[in-house]
């Protein structure tokens, strides 16, 4: 297993609709054809997997149908979008990139993107 540098923004505020997008960029040392991207969430020392996708270079990322993540790739960049976020989902979202094929296997883990999520203010009751 060889190490690889992964860069991602430090802080992102999700939209009022609970959507956060950020780029995860990896310094590919070779010509990988198969890449696996995993998003991990760290909150209060607990790390959980949010979503993962394996893709062939030049093709779209395919997450599971029920995944809250979508993404596109361009060269050594992966544009990740996480939706359905609520205030309780605020946390550090870490991008993990694995170059699966051809060998050698490379692994890179970013420092994480702190995603802040603000629940929208409830609309005031209106009398008709």
């Amino acid at each position: 297993c060889k190490a690889m540098h992964v860069a991602q923004p430090a802080v992102v505020l999700a939209s009022s609709r609970g959507i956060a997008s950020f780029v995860c960029e990896y310094a590919s040392p070779g010509k990988a054809t198969e890449v696996r991207v995993t998003v991990l969430r760290q909150a209060d020392s607990q790390v959980t997997e949010v979503c993962a996708a394996t893709y062939m270079m030049g093709n779209e990322l395919t997450f599971l149908d029920d995944s809250i993540c979508t993404g596109t790739s361009s060269g050594n960049q992966v544009n990740l979008t996480i939706q359905g976020l609520r205030a309780m989902d605020t946390g550090l979202y870490i991008c993990k990139v694995e170059l699966m094929y051809p060998p050698p296997y490379y692994l890179g883990i970013g420092n994480g993107t702190q995603i802040y999520v603000i629940d929208p203010e409830p609309c005031p009751d209106s009398d008709f």
């Epitope: 923004p9 430090a10 997008s21 209060d44 702190q114 802040y116």
Partner: antibody
Framework: QVQLVQSGAEVKKPGASVKVSCKAS????????ISWVRQAPGQGLEWMGW????????NYAQKLQGRVTMTTDTSTSTAYMELRSLRSDDTAVYYC??????????WGQGSLVTVSS | EIVLTQSPGTLSLSPGERATLSCRAS???????LAWYQQKPGQAPRLLIY???SRATGIPDRFSGSGSGTDFTLTISRLEPEDFAVYYC?????????FGQGTKVEIK
Amino acid sequence: QVQLVQSGAEVKKPGASVKVSCKASGYTFTSYGISWVRQAPGQGLEWMGWISVYNGNTNYAQKLQGRVTMTTDTSTSTAYMELRSLRSDDTAVYYCARVGANWFDPWGQGSLVTVSS
Amino acid sequence: EIVLTQSPGTLSLSPGERATLSCRASQSVSSSYLAWYQQKPGQAPRLLIYGASSRATGIPDRFSGSGSGTDFTLTISRLEPEDFAVYYCQQYGSSPWTFGQGTKVEIK
């Protein structure tokens, strides 16, 4: 080193607007947020809101909603805070601070805004 | 809105003494999102502690933070002359982000 440098003191009349700038250096500007905090004379710190420089999304304190606008110019690594319809109780030192994963650091030196007729 | 209440309002101590500052939240705050700042007259606040207990870069080890849930503490083990200032706690886990009203540590 990481630094935030703010614009100078301003004197404004009630009802006017003020725009305070905060120029960042020493780090990747788009990777972090910028928060604004104010401090009235002899008082404590009041959080005004913040902007996620990466995507431009903002979160404002409810009491200032509609009067405050936070923006950034990524070409010059500068953040701006505009406050409209100024009142005498808006007289304060206005600070910008870099928002990291779980901290505000560093802070700008502060900009005194005096609202007086 | 989470209200942070700091106590005492003023702490009168001598250099070399131990200072214990309290910050109590009106509802639970994730310890990841609780910070302490020091402010001296005419200066901007300076980050001391983040994540309730992690010391910021360049902060001497006489400063320590602890606590979880609704009760947080900043401890200065041995007061130095330059430590006399106002200290604020802040939470940024729940919007609106809020500050405590401050504790002034003054020379006795």
